[in-house]
C-alpha cells in the first residue's frame, strides 16, 4: 500500500482551509477523548480511478468520496482520517485531513474526496473514513467503512496499467487445443514480442473429478525475433488412461518484467460426450480384470513425449 507520488495533496475547497498529513492511523483523540464529537460520514463511495505518476506510469487508485451530515455537529468537526486496509496482508495506510478553519453551514452539502491510494490488481480493501475527533469509548461511532475489490489484470482498463503490463497483461496467446488421434493434443498459441522461453503445463483429470490423473510439462525455447507474434505449435502425447479425458493446458511465459510470476493463460478440453444408449452388457462377466502394467498417475520423469515448431 502506498500513496501516488506526485502533486501536493490537496483537501482545501472554497470556505475551508485544509491540509493533508500522513497519519499513524492512531489519532490523538483516541488517546485523549473529547466530550463533543462530530457525527459520522454520509454516503461513502469508493470507485476505481486511474492516475499517472510523474514518471508517466499508470496506476489504479481508490477514489474515495463522502459527504457530511447536515447537523450541528459539523461545528465540532476538526478533520477526517482516511484508512485503507489491504485484507490479505493486514497492511494499513492512513492519511489525515486537518481542517485549519471551522466549517460553516452553507447551501450545498459539504463533499470531500481523495484519489491517492494506489491499489493492487485483484486485491480487496476495507476503506474507512473517520471523522475527527474520534468518539469517547462508549460514544456512537463516527466512521463509515466499505469494501473495495479491485479488478484483476483481465479487466479492460486494468490491462494497460503499469503493474498489469509488468506481469504480461498485453500478451494474448489466443490458445487453441485440438485432440488428435493416438492420444495426442495439438496446442497452438501466439508468441509475444520478447525473446523469452515458455512452459506448457498439461494437467489431465477424470470426467467429474478435480484430482489430476496425468501431468506433463513441456519447455519451449525462446523464439528468435523473426518468430515474434507467430504461432507456435506443439504436439503433446497423453498417457493412455481410460477416463483421464479432461485436459487443462496452461501456458506460462517468463517475460523479463515478471520472470516466473507472469500471468498465465489456459484452455480446457472437456471429456467427449457420453453416449445416451449404454453399451450392451456381455452374458459372461469375468470375476476379475487382468492386471494392468502401471498404476502410477503422476508424470515424474517426463513420460509424455512432445515436439514443437514455430509456424510462420
Amino acid at each position: 500500500l502506498r500513496l501516488l507520488d506526485h502533486r501536493a495533496l490537496v483537501c482545501s475547497q472554497p470556505g475551508l482551509n485544509c491540509t493533508v498529513k500522513n497519519s499513524t492511523c492512531l489519532d490523538d483523540s483516541w488517546i485523549h477523548p473529547r466530550n463533543l464529537t462530530p457525527s459520522s460520514p454520509k454516503d461513502l463511495q469508493i470507485q476505481l480511478h486511474f492516475a499517472h505518476t510523474q514518471q508517466g506510469d499508470l496506476f489504479p487508485v481508490a477514489h474515495i468520496e463522502w459527504t457530511l451530515q447536515t447537523d450541528a455537529s459539523i461545528l465540532y468537526l476538526e478533520g477526517a482520517e482516511l484508512s485503507v486496509l489491504q485484507l490479505n496482508t493486514n497492511e494499513r495506510l492512513c492519511v489525515k485531513f486537518q481542517f485549519l478553519s471551522m466549517l460553516q453551514h452553507h447551501r450545498k452539502r459539504w463533499r470531500f474526496s481523495f484519489s491517492h491510494f494506489v491499489v493492487d490488481p485483484g486485491q480487496e480493501y476495507e476503506v474507512t473514513v473517520h471523522h475527527l475527533p474520534k468518539p469517547i469509548p462508549d460514544g456512537d461511532p463516527n466512521h463509515q467503512s466499505k469494501n473495495f475489490l479491485v479488478p484483476d489484470c483481465e479487466h479492460a482498463r486494468m490491462k494497460v496499467t503499469t503493474p498489469c503490463m509488468s506481469s504480461g497483461s498485453l500478451w494474448d496467446p489466443n490458445i487453441t487445443v485440438e485432440t488428435l488421434e493416438a492420444h495426442q493434443l495439438r496446442v497452438s498459441f501466439t508468441l509475444w514480442n520478447e525473446s523469452t522461453h515458455y512452459q506448457i503445463l498439461l494437467t489431465s483429470f477424470p470426467h467429474m473429478e478435480n484430482h489430476s490423473c496425468f501431468e506433463h510439462m513441456h519447455h519451449i525455447p525462446a523464439p528468435r525475433p523473426e518468430e515474434f507474434h507467430q504461432r507456435s505449435n506443439v504436439t503433446l502425447t497423453l498417457r493412455n488412461l481410460k477416463g483421464c479425458c479432461r485436459h487443462q493446458v496452461q501456458i506460462q511465459p517468463f517475460f523479463s518484467s515478471c520472470l516466473n510470476d507472469c500471468l498465465r493463460h489456459s484452455a480446457t478440453v472437456s471429456c467427449p460426450e457420453m453416449p445416451d444408449t449404454p453399451e450392451p452388457i456381455p452374458d459372461y462377466m469375468p470375476l476379475w480384470e487382468p492386471r494392468s502394467g502401471s498404476s502410477d498417475y503422476k508424470d515424474d520423469d517426463d513420460k509424455g513425449s512432445s515436439h514443437h515448431h514455430h509456424h510462420h
Epitope: 492511523c25 492512531l26 486496509l85 485484507l87 490479505n88 496482508t89 493486514n90 497492511e91 494499513r92 485483484g122 486485491q123 480487496e124 476495507e126 474507512t128 466512521h143 467503512s145 466499505k146 469494501n147 510470476d261 507472469c262 500471468l263 498465465r264
Partner: antibody, heavy 118, light 107 residues
C-alpha cells in the same frame, strides 16, 4: 502479552448450533482483520472465515457458507463464530488467528473443541 | 478456487539432513504464501510469510523460496525439535486455503 482465548466449544447433535467466542488482549484488536481456522481430528488445517477490522469484508470457506456467521465487537475486543445446522464433518478444534502485517497468521489461540455427534 | 498441493505428504530424515518440502498452487499467487509448523497437540506457528521472509524468532535453518505457483520450504540442518507437520497457505485473496500438510520425522 498478545493473547487470543477461544471459548464456547462443546458437544452438539447434528443440526444443532453453537456460538464460539475469541477474547483478544495485548494488541489493538480494532486494527486487525481476524480469522477462524479449524482442524478435524487427525486432519490438516482448514481456513473457515475472515472478517475485516470494521466488519465491512467477510468471507467464508465453501464448506461452511450459509451455515456459519462470523462477527466481532471491537468495543469488547471479541470475535465470534455462530455455527448453525452443524454436521458430523464440523467436528474439529477451532482456532481464532490474527493476521500478521505482511501476510500469514502470527497469533493463534489454543483452540476450542467442537464435537458434532448423535 | 485455487488448489494447494504439497509434496511429499510425509518424510523421514536424519538429524543434520537438508530437508525440502514443496508447495504448488494451481494458479499464480505471486509471493502471497505462508509456511506454518504444527507440533502434535499444539497450535500452528508461523515460520515464513511473503514466500521467503522469516518470521521473527524462527531459527535461520528455515528458509522459503518461490513465486507464482511453485514454492519451497527448506530446513538446512534438521533438528529433533523440527519433528512436526508443515503447512503452506496461500493468501493472495479469499479463500485463504492451506495445503494438505507434510509430516516430518526423524529416522
Amino acid at each position: 502479552e498478545v493473547q487470543l482465548v477461544e471459548s464456547g466449544g462443546g458437544s452438539v447433535q447434528p443440526g444443532g448450533s453453537l456460538r464460539l467466542s475469541c477474547a483478544a488482549s495485548g494488541f489493538t484488536f480494532s486494527s486487525y482483520s481476524m480469522n477462524w481456522v479449524r482442524q478435524a481430528p487427525g486432519k490438516g488445517l482448514e481456513w473457515v472465515s475472515i472478517i475485516s477490522s470494521r466488519s465491512s469484508i467477510i468471507h467464508y470457506a465453501d464448506s461452511v457458507k450459509g451455515r456459519f456467521t462470523i462477527s466481532r465487537d471491537n468495543a469488547k475486543n471479541s470475535l465470534y463464530l455462530q455455527m448453525n445446522s452443524l454436521r458430523d464433518e464440523d467436528t474439529a478444534v477451532y482456532y481464532c488467528a490474527r493476521p500478521k502485517v505482511g501476510g500469514g497468521m502470527d497469533v493463534w489461540g489454543q483452540g476450542t473443541t467442537v464435537t458434532v455427534s448423535s | 478456487d485455487i488448489q494447494m498441493t504439497q509434496s511429499p505428504s510425509s518424510l523421514s530424515a536424519s538429524v543434520g539432513d537438508r530437508v525440502t518440502i514443496t508447495c504448488r498452487a494451481s494458479q499464480g499467487i505471486s509471493n502471497y504464501l505462508a509456511w506454518y509448523q504444527q507440533k502434535p497437540g499444539k497450535f500452528p506457528e508461523l515460520l515464513i510469510y511473503a514466500a521467503s521472509t522469516l518470521q521473527s524468532g524462527v531459527p535461520s535453518r528455515f528458509s522459503g523460496s518461490g513465486s507464482g505457483t511453485d514454492f519451497t520450504l527448506t530446513i538446512s540442518s534438521l533438528q529433533p525439535e523440527d519433528v512436526a507437520t508443515y503447512y503452506c497457505q496461500k493468501y493472495n485473496r479469499a479463500p485463504f486455503t492451506f495445503g494438505p500438510g507434510t509430516k516430518v520425522d526423524i529416522k
